[in-house]
């Protein structure tokens, strides 16, 4: 299975709210013996490699934010620390996965990582991650509502917070 | 909040099979990643005896695959442990513990141990 | 099997001192840029309770003078300022390869 990114920009002004958003793609094992675990974090720009550096969202770890569940389950993140922290992630039936942000700073731009382990018996991982931007705009340039750009192409498509 | 309890007899003969059952309340052992045996000597250090995976499979310490098997009671949350002819060296406190993922594997959860002694 | 062998097996030292504690894997124990090495702090008549995860991790609800480092066969436990009750014994714990296994472990002691 791979992991798509379909927004690679998301451009937010400050005060908003965002779903920053992952799909999983291609076959994925429902099987009783499989487990995913799915995550978000920060990492860095520059990097040899992409995400691999892992760095707290809003000082909550990848641990603090991770989903874990079967593969024909969907999950969220009840942990009222996520919560405290305006942070939920989530997961659906259809491979969606997701981290909403509320009340966006300044502080909350940069690079986000989401990522998926495929775990079987005994122990086995497969790791697939993607990765996508968060600018948050303040003053009197920023947009009205967030504006997320395609991973595939440039063309920008408006959408209303929640 | 997930706990696990060990249950069985303290005292075992030679020759015998230590039966021991780890009862899990607050999380269902199919709906988690693996579930541990791991024993401790009289001031020794820990070792790892074996584990039962959610889907009932099951992976043992090559040291002791011979004389081990692990088995799981999904109706009642509990998973045990067998360890066949059993000599004065299997004296130990045995823990049973639930194992996690965070690009590691780790023991986050333990019971509070049983000690059972082999004794004629 | 990974065999750990931890240093030193006795620690004596005073509350408010620095502890270093080090564990030695007879092969590296990295996955992909983790470290599947995870240690543990057990006290008398207890069960081993997590500290550390993935070699630098710290568990939900330990105290932050709990810190650890390493990769590939050589990792550290530091503990910044040590607490009366943190005189324990600790044993490293590797993932990366079945038979799981674990350190000797190392007594940490009141001087």
């Known amino acids: 299975f791979k992991v798509a990114t379909p927004y690679s920009l998301y451009v937010c002004p400050e005060g908003q709210n965002v779903t920053l958003t992952c799909r999983l793609l291609g076959p994925v094992d429902k099987g009783h013996d499989v487990t995913f675990y799915k995550t978000w974090y920060r990492s860095s720009r520059g990097e040899v490699q992409t995400c691999s550096e892992r760095r707290p969202i809003r000082n909550l770890t990848f641990q603090d934010l991770h989903l874990h569940h079967g593969g024909h389950q969907a999950a969220n993140t009840s942990h009222d620390l996520a919560q405290r922290h305006g942070l939920e992630s989530a997961s659906d039936h259809h491979g969606n996965f997701s981290i909403t942000m509320r009340n966006l700073t300044l502080l909350d731009s940069g690079l986000y990582c989401c990522l998926v382990v495929e775990i079987r018996h005994h122990h086995s991982e497969h790791r697939v991650h993607g990765a996508m931007e968060l600018q948050v705009q303040t003053g009197k340039d920023a947009p009205s509502n967030c504006v997320v750009y395609p991973s595939s192409s440039q063309d920008s498509e408006n959408i209303t917070a929640a | 909040q997930v706990q696990l309890q060990e249950s069985g007899p303290g005292l075992v003969k030679p020759s015998q099979t230590l039966s021991l059952t780890c009862t899990v309340t607050?999380?269902?052992?199919?709906?988690?990643?693996?579930w541990h045996w791991i024993r401790q000597p009289p001031g020794k250090g820990l070792e790892w005896i074996g584990d039962i995976h959610k889907s009932g499979s099951t992976n043992y310490n090559p040291s002791l695959k011979s004389r081990v098997t692990i088995s799981r009671d999904t109706s009642k949350n509990q998973f045990s442990l067998k360890l066949s002819s059993v000599t004065a060296a299997d004296t130990a406190v045995y823990y049973c513990?639930?194992?996690?993922?965070?690009?590691?594997?780790?023991?986050?959860?333990w019971g509070q141990g049983t000690t059972v002694t082999v004794s004629s | 099997d990974i065999v750990l062998t931890q240093s030193p097996a006795t620690l004596s030292l005073s509350p408010g001192e620095r502890a270093t504690l080090s564990c030695r894997a007879s092969q590296s124990v990295d996955y992909d840029g983790d470290s599947y090495m995870n240690w543990y702090q057990q006290k008398p008549g207890q069960a081993p309770r997590l500290l550390i995860y993935?070699?630098?991790n710290l568990e939900s609800g330990i105290p932050a003078r709990f810190s650890g480092s390493g990769s590939g066969r050589d990792f550290t436990l530091t503990i910044s300022s040590l607490e009366p009750e943190d005189f324990a014994t600790y044993y490293c714990q590797q993932s990366i390869e079945d038979p799981w296994t674990f350190g000797g472990g190392t007594k940490l002691e009141i001087k």
């Open positions: 993935g070699a630098s």
């Open positions: 513990a639930r194992d996690y993922y965070g690009f590691s594997w780790y023991f986050d959860v």
């Open positions: 607050g999380y269902s052992i199919t709906g988690g990643y693996n």
